[in-house]
C-alpha cells in the first residue's frame, strides 16, 4: 500500500508542512528500550545491526520481551497510558526486556495516511526481531506485541512478516475504522502470533465504532459488550465536557483496553474473568457464565492460551475503574402467575447477604421480557467479595408512574376488577457464582408464602448447595 | 549540564513577524520534545505548543494555532517559534521548556525566556 | 481545558517556617502534577514532578502531595532563596495548563 516517503525513509507530515529545515533523512521507526520505570529516563534506542546498545543497555537475550506499539496520534507525543503499560510491565516481569516502537513520524498524520503506514511499521519491527533471533538465547516464543488502537494492527503486520511465529500478541481495542470486515492479512488475526489475545472497548453498531468490533483473535474479549464502558459515560465525565469536549469520552472507553491490561499486570490478586457466548445479549441475560471446556479465562495478561479456538467471543462486567474486577451472578428464577400481569414487566431488585459482606440492591436487568410460568434467567454482578452467599432478599418496585404504565394498570382493574392486584410467585431461586462456578439453591421460608406484588418483599434462604432438587414434583402443586 | 540558550529581547511593530530561537545543548535533542510557554506581564504561564525534534511533527494549543509556527533545525539543536501579525497582546515573556517523551513528563529545563514588546 | 486554580495568589512567611500552596484541577489529573518556581529575574525551575517526585537538585525542605484533584506544595523550613512565585502545572490532557500563581515573599 501507498505510503509517504521512499524507501530512504523520507517522511512528508501530512498534518505539519514540513519546512525547509525538517526535510532531511530520517528513520521513520525507532525501538527505545525502557531501561527504567521512570518516565524521565531517556532509555535506550536500538536499531538492526547495531549490538553495542543491547550490551550497553543489558538486554536480557533470556527473558520475556514486550514491544508496546501505539497508534495513531494527533499530538505527536506518547499519551500517559504508554508511561502507566510501561511501569506496569517493568513491576510484573522484573528482568523483562520492554521496548516502545515510536512511529510517531508515520502515526502523526492524516488517520487514512496513518493506515497506510501500518504495515511498513509492521514490516520494521519484523526485521528487528528477524535481527534478535540471529542472537544466541533469543527466542521469538518469548516475544509478547502489544498493540493500542491502529498499533494492533500494526502488530499483526509484524506477527504476519516475521521468520517464525512470535508468542503473543495482545490487541488493545483494535482500530476499527479501514479494517472491520478486512481480509485477513490486512488486519490482526489469530495467524500472527501463537496465541492472540484482543480486549474490545469502543464497538458501536451504529455510528463510528472506533474499536473493531469483529473478532479478530483466538480470544476475543467484549468488557462490558465492548461499548459503554462503567465511568465513561457523559455524566461521569461531564467535568470534561465542560471544559473539553466529547473527545474525552471517545478516550476513556477506547483507552479503557490499556487500563485493563495495566490492572491485570498490577492486580494479580483481583483477576477478572470472562465468559464465552455468542452474543452481549445472551451474556447479559445471564445464560453463558459456564467455564467447562475452556469457556471461561482471565483477562489481560493473564489469559490462558487458547490456540484451539478462533475468534471465540467472550464477556463480562468491570467496575469504573482499577481494580475493575467484579463478582458475575447468574440467577435462574422461575416466576408463576395465575392472572394477567399486562404489558408492563416487574421491577425487580435482589439483595445478596454473603459471610464477607452484602450487596447493594442490585436490579435484575430485564433484557428482552419476562417469561411467566417459565424460568428466567438474570446476571447480576457486585463489586465486593461477598463469600459465601447465606440469603437474599426480592424487591419488586411500585409501578413506575408514567402514563403508558397508570393506563395498563387502570386497563388491567377493568378487565379484573375482583384481582387488581398484580402477583408473582416464586419459590426458588438458583444462584450460580461465575468466579468459583459454585451453585446454590435458595427456596422462601415458608412454601406458602412465595408471592410477591408491587412494592412487596420476599426473602430466600439458602436450601441446599448445587441445583438438583430431591423432590422433582412442580412447586406450584400447592399454589393451585 | 542541560542548556536551553534563547535569544535576546525584541521590539517591533504591530503587524510585524518575529522568530525567536532556542538553542539546546547538553543532551540528545531528538529524544525530548520543545515546549513553547508565554508569559504576558505579571499573568500565569500559558502553553503554546510543542515540536518534537525527531521529525519535526508540531501540535499547537487551539488558541495560537493560527499565531505562532514551530520548527527546528537538528544541525544545529536549535528550535524556532515564529509569531506572525503582532499585536500589543503579543507582548511578553517567551519561554522554551525541554519536556520528556509522555504527555506526563514535567517541563524539566528552561530556557532564560525571551521578552518581546510590541508597541508602535 | 483542564482548569488549574491556585487560590492564593500572595503568601507572606518568615525564615524557617513551614508553608504550603495549593493548587486544584478542574477534574482529576490522576497525580500527573508538576511544579515549578520563577525566581523574580525570570528564572524558571522545576521542583516537583508526578505529584511528589523531587527533581535531581531541588533540596529535600520541598515536598509535594496530593490526588485526583487537589494537590499540594509544603517547603519546611523556608530559605532565603524559596522567596519566589510558585506554579502547578497539569500533565493529564493537551492543551497543557498552569495555576495562576503564588508568590512567596518574605515576612
Known amino acids: 500500500s501507498p505510503v509517504p516517503f521512499g524507501p530512504e525513509g523520507r517522511l512528508e507530515d501530512k498534518l505539519h508542512k514540513p519546512k525547509a529545515t525538517q526535510t532531511e533523512v530520517k528513520p521513520s521507526v525507532r525501538f527505545n528500550l525502557r531501561t527504567s520505570k521512570d518516565p524521565e529516563h531517556e532509555g535506550c534506542y536500538l536499531s538492526v545491526g547495531h549490538s553495542q546498545p543491547l550490551e550497553d543497555c543489558s538486554f536480557n537475550m533470556t527473558a520475556k520481551t514486550f514491544f508496546i506499539i501505539h497508534g495513531w496520534t494527533m499530538s505527536g507525543i506518547f499519551e500517559n497510558w504508554l508511561h502507566k503499560l510501561v511501569s506496569a510491565l517493568h513491576t510484573r516481569e522484573k528482568d523483562a526486556n520492554v521496548v516502545v516502537v515510536d512511529w510517531l513520524p508515520l502515526a502523526h498524520q492524516l488517520y487514512t495516511d496513518a493506515v497506510n503506514n501500518t504495515r511498513v511499521v509492521g514490516h520494521s519491527i519484523a526485521r528487528m526481531l528477524d535481527w534478535l533471533q540471529e542472537k544466541d538465547d533469543f527466542s521469538l516464543g518469548n516475544v509478547h506485541l502489544i498493540g493500542y488502537s491502529l498499533g494492533a494492527h500494526v502488530a499483526g503486520y509484524a506477527g504476519n512478516f516475521v521468520k517464525g511465529t512470535v508468542g503473543r500478541i495482545t490487541g488493545l481495542d483494535p482500530a476499527g475504522p479501514m479494517f472491520e470486515g478486512a481480509d485477513i492479512h490486512k488486519r490482526l488475526s489469530p495467524d500472527d502470533a501463537d496465541f492472540v489475545d484482543v480486549l474490545h472497548t469502543y464497538t458501536r453498531s451504529f455510528g463510528l465504532s472506533i474499536g473493531i468490533q469483529m473478532p479478530v483473535g483466538h480470544i476475543d474479549i467484549y468488557p462490558n459488550g465492548g461499548d459503554f464502558q462503567p465511568g465513561c459515560g457523559l455524566n461521569d465525565v461531564l467535568g470534561s465536557i465542560a471544559y473539553g469536549t466529547i473527545t474525552e469520552v471517545v478516550k476513556c472507553e477506547h483507552e479503557r483496553a490499556v487500563h485493563l491490561f495495566v490492572d491485570s499486570l498490577v492486580n494479580q490478586d483481583k483477576p477478572s474473568f470472562a465468559f464465552q457466548c455468542t452474543d452481549s445479549n445472551r451474556f447479559k441475560k445471564g445464560i453463558c457464565l459456564s467455564c467447562r471446556k475452556n469457556r471461561c479465562n482471565n483477562i489481560g495478561y493473564n489469559a490462558k492460551k487458547m490456540r484451539k479456538k478462533r475468534n471465540s467471543k467472550m464477556y463480562l462486567k468491570t467496575r469504573a475503574g482499577m481494580p475493575f474486577k467484579v463478582y458475575h451472578y447468574q440467577l435462574k428464577v422461575h416466576m408463576f402467575s395465575y392472572n394477567n400481569s399486562g404489558d408492563t414487566q416487574p421491577t425487580l431488585y435482589i439483595t445478596l447477604y454473603g459471610s464477607n459482606a452484602d450487596s447493594q440492591n442490585l436490579p435484575l436487568e430485564i433484557v428482552e421480557k419476562i417469561e411467566l410460568n417459565a424460568t428466567n434467567t438474570f446476571l447480576v454482578y457486585t463489586e465486593e467479595d461477598l463469600g459465601d452467599l447465606l440469603k437474599m432478599r426480592l424487591t419488586w418496585e411500585g409501578v413506575a408512574h408514567s402514563w403508558y404504565n397508570l393506563w395498563n394498570e387502570f386497563r388491567n382493574y377493568l378487565s379484573q376488577p375482583s384481582n387488581p392486584s398484580r402477583e408473582l410467585y416464586i419459590r426458588r431461586i438458583r444462584v450460580k457464582s461465575g468466579e468459583t462456578q459454585r451453585k446454590v439453591t435458595f427456596c422462601t421460608q415458608d412454601p406458602t408464602k412465595s408471592s410477591i406484588s408491587p412494592g412487596q418483599e420476599l426473602w430466600f434462604h439458602k436450601c441446599q448447595d448445587g441445583w438438583k432438587m430431591k423432590n422433582k414434583t412442580s412447586p406450584f402443586v400447592n399454589l393451585a | 549540564e542541560v542548556q536551553l540558550q534563547q535569544s535576546g529581547p525584541e521590539l517591533l511593530k504591530p503587524g510585524a513577524s518575529v522568530k525567536i530561537s532556542c538553542k539546546a545543548s547538553g543532551y540528545t535533542f531528538t529524544d525530548n520534545t520543545i515546549h513553547w510557554v508565554k508569559q504576558s506581564h505579571g499573568k500565569s504561564l500559558e502553553w503554546i505548543g510543542h515540536i518534537n525534534p525527531y521529525y519535526g511533527g508540531t501540535n499547537n494549543n487551539e488558541k495560537f494555532k493560527d499565531k505562532a509556527t514551530l520548527t527546528v533545525d537538528k544541525s544545529s539543536s536549535t528550535a524556532y517559534m515564529e509569531l506572525r501579525s503582532l499585536t500589543s497582546e503579543d507582548s511578553a515573556i517567551y519561554y522554551c521548556a525541554r519536556k520528556g517523551i509522555y504527555y506526563s513528563s514535567p517541563f524539566d529545563y528552561w530556557g532564560q525566556g525571551t521578552t518581546l514588546t510590541v508597541s508602535s | 481545558d483542564i482548569q488549574m486554580t491556585q487560590t492564593t495568589s500572595s503568601l507572606s512567611a518568615s525564615l524557617g517556617d513551614r508553608v504550603t500552596i495549593s493548587c486544584r484541577a478542574s477534574q482529576d489529573i490522576n497525580n500527573y502534577l508538576n511544579w515549578y518556581q520563577q525566581k523574580p529575574d525570570g528564572t524558571v525551575k522545576l521542583l516537583i514532578s508526578?505529584?511528589?517526585k523531587l527533581h535531581s537538585g531541588v533540596p529535600s525542605r520541598f515536598s509535594g502531595s496530593g490526588s485526583g484533584t487537589d494537590y499540594s506544595l509544603t517547603i519546611s523550613n523556608l530559605e532565603r532563596e524559596d522567596f519566589a512565585t510558585y506554579f502547578c502545572?497539569?500533565?493529564?490532557?493537551?492543551?497543557?495548563?498552569f495555576g495562576s500563581g503564588t508568590n512567596l515573599e518574605i515576612k
Open positions: 508526578y505529584t511528589s
Open positions: 502545572q497539569q500533565g493529564n490532557t493537551l492543551p497543557f495548563t
